[in-house]
């Protein structure tokens, strides 16, 4: 009779995590007698998959009936692949003894696993920043294979360069995680900015998973600020104006100060939001220049977002004022902005003088 | 290792039915052939069925199609041989063999079971 | 059905001797390049217990002085040197359709 050999046809088999998976494997003779074995792996720590003879395999069936008559076909079906099923698998005809002794293994075959990746789960900065500062957003997804994958990054559907991505582990593994950190200049412009993680995949069939990040969360657009005199009203009393304009987050306290002293605290509440995402607010004290024997200085203090407040200051010239008439109006603008904001449009940057 | 055991030793009476268990352990039942052997005293081997225990298929000797009948429980590991309408000429050591390697052949015995048909 | 006819049905052998014992089929039992015969010993008191398989191939466990042959209709068991724990009834059995035996043939020491 011929010698046995024991065939595995396929050198690999790509299953889809979930599915089922069918290893071939026959034998060219009924001699010698004995069960088939399957294993994962080789050598001393290989793992028994199925055995013909004995043991409870409840993921494993052998394709063709066992007790067919003349049976050379050890195929078997292994049901719901995960992951962790990955490997090489090796048909293994066994003689019957006691115990029953190796005879000749199959060549193996690799099963790989396509597992889809998770969804991309973008996360941005623990705190805020400013306009033109650097900002890094981190992209992550697990659980794929096989281990090639491609990330792009964008920001409102244009592509970015500036990023770095690793997949790990660097060696063979059942699946892998891929994370990626992108940096993204900010403008003032950004608020209602959106940055994209786009991770394609073999298992996805040409439709990448995103994960998205609002820029929102991670930029702070500071406040201009103007102080202002309105017309002189007729009852000796002066109405002053503090606009605080184009800011980012709504987060804002405004503080009047006379002559240093707190006359009043606001903060900002259900602002109108700006077609760029950010808030104007508009606050006016009316300053009694009869109840002053002095020239006045008002000074608006806004504080944004937990930041150091920003000061505008404003004075009111008493002596400019005749008591008993409230016609003739003069006040001067003295104030310095402490920060000079810019953005973008009007070409200043923000510094402390 | 492959164990088949079974029954102990029956009298009937001509007319009766004996219905013989074999226990198997030491393997997968559904995966192979039980065979049933009859050997009368100072006589030959006499085949008189098999049965596949994954799907309960049934192959008869002619001779015995009518009066035996094959089943499996696969919850025990048992298989079950009944014989119907006994004469005095069944009186017989009774085999089961397990198949090992579907060659319809009888690789592993059980001891036997000896059935005495007498009035 | 195929009828197998053992030769002789007795047969007594020296300690040391060769054993020869022949079965033949009523028809061929091969099939596929296989040929379908089995022989099994039986000792007093005791199943029977597989020697051959497949007409030549020899049963783990057991002694290498037993060996089988023949193809088609015509097959031999033999015991090359016999020995006192080889006294025994043998019995050849086919599969090429469903299973017979031969009458048996018993071996005894001269």
């Known amino acids: 009779e011929e010698e046995l050999q024991v065939i595995q046809p396929e050198k690999s088999v790509s299953v889809a995590a979930g599915d089922s998976a069918t290893l071939n494997c026959t034998v060219t003779s009924l001699i010698p007698v004995g069960p088939i074995q399957w294993f994962r792996g080789a050598g001393p720590g290989r793992e028994l998959i199925y055995h013909q003879k004995e043991g409870h395999f409840p993921r494993v069936t052998s394709v063709s009936e066992s007790t067919k008559r003349n049976n050379m076909d050890f195929s078997i079906h292994i049901s719901n692949i995960t992951p962790a099923d990955a490997g090489t698998y090796y048909c293994v005809k066994f003689r019957k003894g006691s115990p029953d002794v190796e005879v000749k293994s199959g060549a193996g075959t690799e099963l790989s696993v396509r597992a889809k990746p998770s969804a991309p789960v973008v996360s941005g900065p623990a705190v805020r920043a400013t306009a033109e500062h650097t900002v890094s957003f981190t992209c992550e997804s697990h659980g794929f294979s096989p281990r090639d994958i491609t990330l792009k990054w964008f920001k409102n559907g244009n592509e970015l360069s500036d990023f770095q991505t690793n997949v790990d582990p660097a060696g063979k593994s059942v699946s892998y995680s891929i994370r990626s950190t992108a940096r993204v200049v900010l403008t003032r412009r950004d608020v209602h900015s959106q940055v994209i993680c786009e991770v394609a995949h073999v298992t996805l069939q040409g439709d990448p998973l995103r994960g998205t990040a609002n820029l929102s969360e991670a930029i702070r657009v500071p406040p201009f600020l103007e102080v202002t005199q309105q017309s002189m009203r007729a009852d000796n009393q002066v109405n002053v104006t503090c606009q605080v304009t184009k800011f980012y987050p709504q987060r804002l306290q405004l503080t009047w100060l006379e002559n240093g002293n707190v006359s009043r605290t606001e903060m900002a509440s259900a602002l109108p939001e700006n077609k760029d995402g950010t808030y104007n607010w508009t606050s006016w004290l009316l300053v009694n220049v009869s109840a002053h024997r002095d020239d006045v200085k008002l000074t608006c203090q806004v504080e944004h977002d937990g930041q150091p407040a920003v000061n505008k200051s404003f004075s009111v010239k008493v002596s400019a004022h005749p008591k008993e008439q409230g016609s003739n109006t003069a006040a001067e603008n003295t104030g310095t902005n402490e920060r000079d904001y810019k953005d973008d449009d009007d070409k200043h940057h923000h510094h402390h003088h | 290792q492959v164990q088949l055991v079974q029954s102990g030793a029956e009298v009937k009476k001509p007319g009766a039915s004996v219905k013989v268990s074999c226990k198997a352990s030491g393997y997968t039942f559904t995966n192979y052939w039980i065979n049933w052997v009859r050997q009368a005293p100072g006589q030959g081997l006499e085949w008189i069925a098999m049965?596949?225990?994954?799907?309960?298929?049934?192959h008869y000797n002619q001779i015995f199609k009518d009066r035996a009948t094959l089943t499996t429980d696969t919850s025990t590991s048992t298989a079950y041989m009944e014989l119907r309408s006994l004469r005095s000429d069944d009186t017989a050591v009774y085999y089961c063999?397990?198949?090992?390697?579907?060659?319809?052949?009888?690789?592993?015995w059980g001891r036997g079971t000896l059935v005495t048909v007498s009035s | 059905d195929i009828v197998l006819t053992q030769s002789p049905d007795s047969l007594a052998v020296s300690l040391g001797e060769r054993a020869t014992i022949n079965c033949r089929a009523s028809k061929s039992v091969s099939s596929s390049g296989y040929n379908y015969i089995f022989w099994y010993q039986q000792k007093p008191g005791q199943p029977p217990k597989l020697l051959i398989y497949l007409a030549s191939n020899l049963d783990p466990g057991v002694p290498d002085r037993f060996s089988g042959s023949g193809s088609g209709t015509d097959f031999t068991l033999t015991i090359s040197s016999l020995q006192a724990e080889d006294v025994a009834v043998y019995y050849c059995q086919h599969s090429r359709e469903l299973p017979t035996f031969g009458q048996g043939t018993k071996l005894e020491i001269k």
């Open positions: 063999a397990m198949d090992y390697g579907s060659l319809y052949a009888m690789d592993y």
């Open positions: 049965i596949d225990p994954s799907d309960s298929e049934t």
